[in-house]
Amino acid sequence: AVNGTSQFTCFYNSRANISCVWSQDGALQDTSCQVHAWPDRRRWNQTCELLPVSQASWACNLILGAPDSQKLTTVDIVTLRVLCREGVRWRVMAIQDFKPFENLRLMAPISLQVVHVETHRCNISWEISQASHYFERHLEFEARTLSPGHTWEEAPLLTLKQKQEWICLETLTPDTQYEFQVRVKPLQGEFTTWSPWSQPLAFRTKPAALGKDT
């Protein structure tokens, strides 16, 4: 039997991708391993090769179909296995019955753009990517703004408790460079987590007009 501690964590992006990370203390770096997906009620199965991301963890993406195709539903269960080559055979190292809509992590929001900017405020919009139509409007967002001289970790989180793909940032300083990020999370799923943060959007507020404040 395998010794050491192990963790096998996967998330579904709600459309056609399951991303997995497997960590195993004492595992050999040069061992060839893969994740195999075996749905309970579908004719396909899928495999991806685990690639090292650190000393003792590996990751891969199970591509189930075209990016916007709805490959799984709320009733699906996919048995996921980590298989590692041991001589001439494949050995099962980890196994889980994966309920995709209980383990959601969406893609980061995309297409961030400044809709309107003034001296003290800025209106920003974005789009969600590869999100299932099943969610309808059952999504929430978190946003953060990077101010000069601060880090992202210090930035206060702004929560949008509904599917609102825009925000109006207020009380900004005139003629100042900022960066903005947003992430998304479905309300559904016991183990659902936030998407990665979007790519930062840089913007600059307008300078205050001489003698008056806009």
Epitope: A1, V2, T5, S6, Q7, F8, W38, D40, I77, T79, R81, V82, R91, V92, M93, A94, I95, Q96, D97
Partner: nanobody, 125 residues
Framework: QVQLVESGGGLVQPGGSLRLSCAIS????????IGWVRQAPGKQREGVSC????????YYADSVKGRFTISKDSAKNTVYLQMTSLKPEDTAVYYC??????????????????WGLGTQVTVSS
């Protein structure tokens, strides 16, 4: 080679209880993911309950949730399945199975490496 031996099956009336045991020899219980799988006459094998080796997390089929409980005694190298509020549809041969991996599966019983010979459970009045 790991060997699994089930016991505790029998005839019980609807609403009754049974406790199945699975004694493991040739290996350490804590080294395996363990599952209970049943097969009714003319039906496919169905995962009933399993216990993950990595963290002792337990899983149950919807049909038995709240009625069956899986547990283990590492000192005795034995896994148990406590079955309560039994129904006629629970009638089946119950197998203990083990997989040399982290985690376990209810959905795909064929992933198990080692199997016992089974114990018959009959629920009838």
């Amino acid at each position: 080679q790991v060997q699994l031996v089930e016991s505790g099956g029998g005839l019980v009336q609807p609403g009754g209880s049974l406790r199945l045991s699975c004694a493991i020899s040739g290996g350490t219980l804590d080294s395996y993911g363990i599952g209970w799988v049943r097969q009714a006459p003319g039906k496919q094998r169905e995962g009933v309950s399993c216990m993950s080796r990595s963290d002792d997390r337990t899983y149950y089929a919807d049909s038995v949730k709240g009625r069956f409980t899986i547990s283990k005694d590492s000192a005795k190298n034995t896994v148990y399945l406590q079955m309560t509020s039994l129904k006629p549809e629970d009638t089946a041969v119950y197998y203990c199975a083990a997989v040399d991996a982290y985690g376990c599966s209810l959905v795909q019983p064929t992933t198990y490496d080692f199997w016992g010979l089974g114990t018959q459970v009959t629920v009838s009045s």
